[in-house]
């Protein structure tokens, strides 16, 4: 399927609007510090060049790969060395090493100012004055802060962003209309970014086989009526799409994703009965809808798995002849029967089955050796079930904020070397599992909770990888993708940790806390809690609760005071002294 000019091919397939948007996303994800105007200029130059290639595919440089064209363009940025330091060395390399070099320099936690939302009227004016620039700016700001955001999905977010402004800037109460929509987009966007980050980590750190296994399990749960060959085809295509997006090949990725959506909709009958509505939508909505579609009903009267995977005399023959195909079939058959299991649990079961066959298919009595393999699954299934039950009970008892605090204490004691902002961010997200999943019936709790926790723990892993400080985090993050959560769950208090020196400044608060949103105020308090545990890792729950209750009362009291700043200064000193005494600091 070779084209004389790859850039012309993609321009024609995607259309000018999507082409420009995707090139902007690609550039912003690579050069995260570059000003918006510089990126727009680069994108316009690339677009003009693409148009010359559409007109004449044999024109000069039109035969170059997209990596070569884009890389050459990025390397024309004048301030590359000053702004990016050693990333500038990438430009001395040839493709494909140059692109790999750019990928390695993507920063999951770029030093960029927090996005502050302007007043609604200001936003509406900007939207009306120059809609195109306004939307490009949205793509740019999201892409540079989320360098692995799933590009075709970001186009869908931008479309919804545009629709929100189009509708709400004409509404009587613009703010009431717009702000909830923007909050929803922000929260969904963060979730989408984190989910995609896990996919890219899976591909980049654990390889294509790991991603394919994940995809087989998930698609088999979602499309249990589809044949194994059909699921395998979808997995192959989906792997290609995500490999491209994670590798910075955003034009190819978006194009292939559109082809995959088209294929799925053309073959609905052999895939799932739940796709009808999705397939009636326009492209971006269609692809999003398919990605989120509910699980189809399981076929009736599925036979026992034991027949083919334990009792058959051909188990070892089938395994030895095509290991990955046979394991894929096992995973498919198990997953389609268990929409109530998390994908990571299904992958643990498949790994256990694989390990057993590796051992038993070399044994003198293979059948006797693997006869009880399904018995080994029981504790693997029960462990997440029990954990979720316990934590949902705790969540229901405490509510989200206090549940987050319990997790903050738990995780700070496990890995106290991790930076406080990372511990706060990760623990807050871990705590959201309660409101997200505990409301579900038993049959939906585990896939909701454990697969969500995998996404959140991956955030910890990618942030920690940038500046590694804990061997325990490194170990849990790198040893096994599917066992990350059990690995972190199993960590006890780090007895080797030397408590942090007490610093009164850390616990000094000012009147500005009173004007913060409830969320920001919670983060301030949770930051203090983490610091408290770092100073006194052996503090009991009761001690910490007492100090935090005193702290909450102190903030409430001073925020009601006439002279807030004086109150914070004087009462703060008393609180610090009382807390030190209570904790024996």
């Amino acid at each position: 399927d070779a084209h004389k000019s790859e850039v012309a091919h993609r321009f024609k397939d995607l259309g000018e609007e999507n082409f420009k948007a995707l090139v902007l996303i690609a550039f912003a994800q690579y050069l995260q510090q570059c000003p918006f105007e510089d990126h727009v200029k680069l994108v316009n130059e690339v677009t003009e060049f693409a148009k010359t290639c559409v007109a004449d595919e044999s024109a000069e440089n039109c035969d170059k790969s997209l990596h070569t064209l884009f890389g050459d363009k990025l390397c024309t940025v004048a301030t590359l060395r000053e702004t990016y330091g050693e990333m500038a060395d990438c430009c001395a390399k040839q493709e494909p090493e140059r692109n790999e070099c750019f990928l390695q320099h993507k920063d999951d936690n770029p030093n960029l100012p927090r996005l502050v939302r302007p007043e609604v009227d200001v936003m509406c004016t900007a939207f009306h004055d120059n809609e195109e620039t306004f939307l490009k700016k949205y793509l740019y700001e999201i892409a540079r802060r989320h360098p692995y955001f799933y590009a075709p999905e970001l186009l869908f977010f931008a479309k919804r962003y545009k629709a929100a402004f189009t509708e709400c800037c004409q509404a009587a109460d613009k703010a009431a209309c717009l702000l909830p929509k923007l909050d929803e987009l922000r929260d969904e966007g963060k979730a989408s970014s984190a989910k995609q980050r896990l996919k890219c980590a899976s591909l980049q750190k654990f390889g294509e086989r790991a991603f394919k296994a994940w995809a087989v399990a998930r698609l088999s749960q979602r499309f249990p009526k589809a044949e194994f060959a059909e699921v395998s085809k979808l997995v192959t295509d989906l792997t290609k799409v995500h490999t491209e997006c994670c590798h910075g090949d955003l034009l190819e990725c978006a194009d292939d994703r559109a082809d995959l959506a088209k294929y799925i909709c053309e073959n609905q009958d052999s895939i799932s009965s739940k796709l009808k509505e999705c397939c009636e939508k326009p492209l971006l909505e269609k692809s999003h809808c398919i990605a989120e579609v509910e699980n189809d009903e399981m076929p009736a009267d599925l036979p026992s798995l034991a027949a083919d995977f334990v009792e058959s005399k051909d188990v070892c023959k089938n395994y030895a002849e095509a290991k990955d195909v046979f394991l894929g079939m096992f995973l498919y058959e198990y997953a389609r029967r268990h929409p109530d299991y998390s994908v990571v649990l299904l992958l643990r079961l498949a790994k256990t089955y694989e390990t057993t066959l590796e051992k038993c298919c070399a044994a003198a009595d293979p059948h006797e050796c693997y006869a009880k393999v399904f018995d080994e699954f029981k504790p693997l299934v029960e462990e997440p079930q029990n954990l979720i039950k316990q934590n949902c009970e705790l969540f229901e008892q405490l509510g989200e904020y206090k549940f987050q605090n319990a997790l903050l204490v738990r995780y700070t004691k496990k890995v106290p070397q991790v930076s406080t902002p990372t511990l706060v961010e990760v623990s807050r997200n871990l705590g959201k599992v309660g409101s997200k999943c505990c409301k579900h019936p038993e049959a939906k709790r585990m896939p909701c909770a454990e697969d969500y926790l995998s996404v959140v723990l991956n955030q910890l892993c990618v942030l920690h990888e940038k500046t590694p400080v804990s061997d325990r985090v490194t170990k849990c993050c790198t040893e096994s993708l599917v066992n990350r959560r059990p690995c972190f769950s199993a960590l006890e208090v780090d007895e080797t940790y030397v408590p942090k020196e007490f610093n009164a400044e850390t616990f000094t608060f000012h009147a500005d806390i009173c004007t913060l949103s409830e969320k920001e105020r919670q983060i301030k308090k949770q930051t203090a809690l983490v610091e408290l545990v770092k100073h006194k890792p052996k503090a009991t729950k009761e001690q910490l609760k007492a100090v935090m209750d005193d702290f909450a009362a102190f903030v409430e009291k001073c925020c009601k005071a006439d002279d807030k700043e004086t109150c914070f200064a004087e009462e703060g000193k008393k609180l610090v002294a009382a807390s030190q005494a209570a904790l024996g600091l």
Epitope: C316, E358, K359, A362
Partner: antibody
């Protein structure tokens, strides 16, 4: 590269016991069965049994139950076979061999000669 | 246990001659493996999983068979092929070996 290094020749009295060793290197010792095979002079090969060092599981040829005891130690990556109540019938070369999927033996030790004589 | 009968027990062949030896099982086996042994050395895996050549084995060797009947064939005998060849079955406990076919060069 994979290597199986066996202990040296043994000359022992009838009725006594002997423990021969097979030191493995160059692969993940825990993840492969270690087999023991007997070969008497000028005769064929006879499978004695096997051990999976990862969890200590064993299988024996019924003819050697009570005669041979196979063990393994993961830290020096060594498999052992103890032979008890020795008679002249036990005089043979004993070879360790790594077992792989579908039951073939891809690497063999150099053999340990056992002579049982009064 | 499954008994493997190898035939012939001893055979000789001239260089360039085609050689076939057989291994017959007392009941059906899943896979057959073949080993070459020269005097004073340990056996070497020669053909495994019925028909796959072990690393370093010349392509003039081949293996085939199913059920109870298996064979090892040398397309064109060479002097270095003179050795004893043992078959071994897998799929039934205990694992068993044939008594061997001793191949000599004429």
């Amino acid at each position: 590269q994979v290597q199986l290094q066996q202990s040296g020749a043994e000359l022992v009295r009838p009725g006594s016991s002997v423990k021969i060793s097979c030191k493995a290197s160059g692969y993940a010792f825990s993840n492969y069965w270690m087999n023991w095979v007997k070969q008497r002079p000028g005769q064929g090969l006879e499978w004695i049994g096997q051990i999976y060092p990862g969890d200590g599981d064993t299988y024996y040829n019924g003819r050697f139950k009570g005669k041979a005891t196979i063990t393994a130690d993961k830290s020096p990556t060594t498999a052992y076979m103890q032979l008890s109540s020795l008679t002249s019938e036990d005089s043979a070369v004993y070879v360790c061999a790594r077992g792989v999927i579908l039951g073939s033996f891809d690497y063999w030790g150099q053999g340990t000669t056992l002579t049982v004589s009064s | 246990q499954i008994v493997l009968t190898q035939s012939p027990a001893i055979m000789s062949a001239s260089p360039g001659e085609k050689v076939t030896m057989t291994c017959s099982a007392s009941s059906s086996v899943s896979y057959m493996h073949w080993y070459q042994q020269k005097s004073g050395t340990s056996p070497k895996r020669w053909i495994y999983d019925t028909s796959k050549l072990a690393s370093g084995v010349p392509v003039r060797f081949s293996g085939s068979g199913s059920g109870t009947s298996y064979s090892l064939t040398i397309r064109s005998m060479e002097a270095e092929d003179a050795a004893t060849y043992y078959c071994q079955q897998w799929g039934s406990n205990p694992l068993t070996f044939g008594a061997g076919t001793k191949l000599e060069i004429k």
